[in-house]
């Protein structure tokens, strides 16, 4: 049975640049050599979130008893293929990408749930899922048709941190303003009542006749 792709020991690529020219892409995808083919399915289109996060499922039809699987995400744009990220995992274990990778993922049976983060509009492109059954033999290789990921940058708006600083400054200003206003008002009131004196309460007759039987206390200062 022929295989789509290449055997890694036969055509070890120099990934220093991590970019493959179009001719190599053709070789990678269409020349049948050295391994068994495997079907890989992935969604046709995915829209990234406003935070630049895109998730999709990569499912492979495992023909053998794989215990070690390698998953690679390739990005095809402008006739070039770039390796986005790659991870090798043991069946039943978690998928672990490098610490600096923009990818995260989980595996469940023959499914790999991939998440790519930090995407911007310029990262829009076809993201191809490549699955290799590394161990035990035989070596299987499967390449998906790709998931077109659309990334739309959100409308430019002020930085949220900057807004918080403005809000904090305005709040602080208002607080100190009200504090000063209160202090000034109190000081003025106290000035009107000075010098401080002592006094006595006396009962005075009411001015209104209908209130004859009621007496209102009134404060009279005594010098």
């Amino acid at each position: 049975m022929a295989c789509l792709g290449f055997q890694r020991h036969k055509a070890q690529l120099n990934l220093a640049t991590r970019t493959w020219p179009c001719t190599l892409l053709f070789f990678l995808l269409f020349i049948p050599v050295f391994c068994k083919a495997m079907h890989v399915a992935q969604p046709a289109v995915v829209l990234a979130s406003s935070r630049g996060i895109a998730s999709f499922v990569c499912e492979y039809a495992s023909p053998g008893k794989a215990t070690e699987v390698r998953v690679t995400v390739l990005r095809q744009a402008d006739s070039q293929v770039t390796e986005v990220c790659a991870a090798t995992y043991m069946m039943g274990n978690e998928l672990t990408f490098l610490d600096d990778s923009i990818c995260t993922g989980t595996s469940s049976g023959n499914q790999v749930n991939l998440t790519i983060q930090g995407l911007r509009a310029m990262d829009t492109g076809l993201y191809i899922c490549k699955v290799e059954l590394m161990y035990p033999p035989p070596y299987y290789l499967g390449i998906g048709n790709g998931t077109q990921i659309y990334v739309i940058d959100p409308e430019p708006c002020p930085d949220s941190d900057f807004l918080l600083w403005i809000l904090a400054a305005v709040s602080s200003g208002l607080f100190f303003y009200s504090f000063l206003l209160t202090a000034v008002s109190l000081s003025k009131m106290l000035k009107k009542r000075s010098p401080l004196t002592t006094g006595v309460y006396v009962k005075m007759p009411p001015t209104e006749p209908e209130c004859e039987k009621q007496f209102q206390p009134y404060f009279i200062p005594i010098n």
Partner: antibody, heavy 120, light 107 residues
Framework: EVQLLQAGAVLARPGTSVKISCKAS????????MNWVKQRPGKGLEWIGM????????SLNQAFKDKAKLTAATSASIAYLEFSSLTNEDSAVYYC?????????????WGQGTLVTVSS | DIQMTQSPSSLSASVGDRVTITCRPS??????LAWYQQKPGKAPKLLLY???NLADGVPSRFSGSGSGTDYTLTISSLQPEDFATYYC?????????FGQGTKLEIK
Amino acid sequence: EVQLLQAGAVLARPGTSVKISCKASGYSFTTYWMNWVKQRPGKGLEWIGMIHPSDSETSLNQAFKDKAKLTAATSASIAYLEFSSLTNEDSAVYYCARIGRRNPYYFDYWGQGTLVTVSS
Amino acid sequence: DIQMTQSPSSLSASVGDRVTITCRPSENLYTNLAWYQQKPGKAPKLLLYGATNLADGVPSRFSGSGSGTDYTLTISSLQPEDFATYYCQHLWGTPFTFGQGTKLEIK
């Protein structure tokens, strides 16, 4: 140093069962598939099957599906081959062999073999 | 299952001779083939893997070639220690079958 150690010889009666062992050392036992190969006197090599010790997943040659049982004890790094309902046809040398993880693949380490003699 | 047809089954040769052993699988192996040497009372020893790759510690007089359904093991100049039985094996899906062997004897 990778080593696969097997018992030298086993004598068994027809109709009984025999369980032979392969003690692995010098590598991570649970990450390699272990194979068993049969060789009758003066004959060629026959692949019996293989086991992945971490989860005891096995792949058996259909010619041995009712005859062989593969097991593994991960704590002791030992792989076992059990042959049941023994007949004279089962008299042979049985080898354990590890599959290398490098592609292209091959059996990179072999045990020295266990001679099973079925005789009444 | 893939059948491995190895020929000849036995071969007589002298020290210094060039010897060729062939292995023909029943289907394309895409070079996923290994060659082993076995001496009496010993376990098989790997000679070549991936049809053409020489295993560590194996003398350069051993070489492998072939692709598809036709593979060859060549010993360029036979040495006394080379008289043994040789097996080809595929690892192109289970069962991993072996050829029936070629017994190389001293003429």
